[in-house]
């Protein structure tokens, strides 16, 4: 069977936006009015993984972009990047693990931890601009909330 | 330091089943982010990945053992499994066993493989 | 999947000699490449990864290049101890791909 997907937008708790940086990158900042469409839209894939009532297994890929959100180890750090992956393959239910991410949602918000590094999570900073990145801490200074707004396809 | 040892091979006719066990030390595959996989060489041939288990039970096969071989891992033995049912002359070779951490993959350390000849 | 050719299966040269062994790639594989060294009777051993990291323990005089599709293994000065069969491994995309393997021998 065909995996399962839906394209959706995402903001962090303080409402700001994401958008590309260059090629390979996510930042972060408020958007208002028409600038609403510069913010990325993610192809959100249902991926084969351990899956329980508030935690769900996915894929973030960009929308009409041959690109996937994945975690390596870069430099003996657990790091986020954009990938690009061979359309034809992508998206598939099986999905390599520096893929995959568990969508937990607790209280109407969504975090997104990386399957491959446990408790790093997709992250944003309290300053406009700054690169979206993976971070090991929740709670502290970095965000680690979002919501989802679905788009329709 | 890290050791992998093999055992499991034998002859065995086509059709049959074989279980292969593949016991560890010197790291935890309860630990985030490990890895094992099997790797097999056919007599005179190059390597080919078989399948993996990662710490979380997430298990991957190529396509040519898909739904027959099954790879499992017991973590209170420091064991992994690679269960290989409806076995076929093409699956005779050289198991191997190896340890990777994190995707994407390099397999760090292996050993030194059971033979497994599939014959009538 | 993705197809991983070492297009030189067998390959002769003496000690002391800079060697080179390629491995190609069908479709681009983001430098999630390694190699490794197989001997008779010895386990596998890893050389390089990530395309151009040396594994610990590994001497110097192997290194490792490339990007895209193309990746290759160099040995500097070839010791008497090098003489093996090379395999390349692409780690991109499930499944897991090894190329079929170049032998180096004594010439």
């Known amino acids: 069977a065909p995996v399962r997907s839906l394209h959706c937008t995402l903001r962090d708790a303080q409402l700001k936006s994401l958008v590309m940086s260059g090629p390979y990158e996510l930042k972060a900042l408020h958007l208002q009015g028409q600038d609403l469409e510069q913010q990325v839209v993610f192809s959100m894939s249902f991926v084969q993984g351990e899956e329980s009532n508030d935690k769900i297994p996915v894929a973030l890929g960009l929308k009409a972009k041959n690109l996937y959100l994945s975690c390596v180890l870069k430099d003996d750090k657990p790091t986020l990047q954009l990938e690009s992956v061979d359309p034809k393959n992508y998206p598939k239910k099986k999905m390599e693990k520096r893929f995959v991410f568990n969508k937990i949602e607790i209280n109407n918000k969504l975090e997104f931890e990386s399957a491959q590094f446990p408790n790093w999570y997709i992250s944003t900073s309290q300053a406009e601009n700054m690169p979206v990145f993976l971070g090991g801490t929740r709670g502290g200074q970095d965000i680690t909330d979002f919501t989802m707004q679905f788009v329709s396809s | 330091q890290v050791q992998l040892v093999e055992s499991g091979g034998g002859v065995v006719q086509p059709g049959r089943s074989l279980r292969l066990s593949c016991a560890f030390s010197g790291f935890s595959l309860s630990t985030s982010g490990m890895g094992v996989g099997w790797i097999r060489q056919a007599p005179g041939k190059g390597l080919e990945w078989v399948a993996h288990?990662?710490?979380?039970?997430?298990?991957s096969y190529a396509d040519s053992v898909k739904g027959r071989f099954t790879i499992s891992k017991d973590n209170s033995k420091n064991t992994v499994y690679l269960q290989m049912n409806s076995l076929r002359a093409e699956d005779t070779a050289v198991y191997f066993c190896?340890?990777?951490?994190?995707?994407?993959?390099?397999?760090?350390?292996w050993g030194q493989g059971t033979l497994v000849t599939v014959s009538s | 999947d993705i197809q991983m050719t070492q297009s030189t299966s067998s390959l002769s040269a003496s000690v002391g000699d800079r060697v080179t062994i390629t491995c190609r790639a069908s479709?681009?594989?983001?430098?999630?490449l390694s190699w490794y060294q197989q001997k008779p009777g010895k386990a596998v051993k890893l050389l390089i990864y990530?395309?151009?990291k040396l594994h610990s323990g590994v001497p110097s005089r192997f290194s490792g290049s490339g990007s895209g599709t193309d990746y290759t293994l160099t040995i500097s000065s070839l010791q008497q101890e090098d003489f093996a069969t090379y395999f390349c491994?692409?780690?991109?995309?499930?499944?897991?791909?090894f190329g079929q393997g170049t032998k180096l021998e004594i010439k």
């Open positions: 288990i990662w710490w979380d039970g997430d298990e």
């Open positions: 491994l692409q780690g991109k995309m499930l499944p897991w791909t």
């Open positions: 190896a340890r990777n951490r994190y995707d994407p993959p390099w397999f760090v350390d």
């Open positions: 479709q681009d594989i983001s430098n999630y």
């Open positions: 990530y395309t151009s």
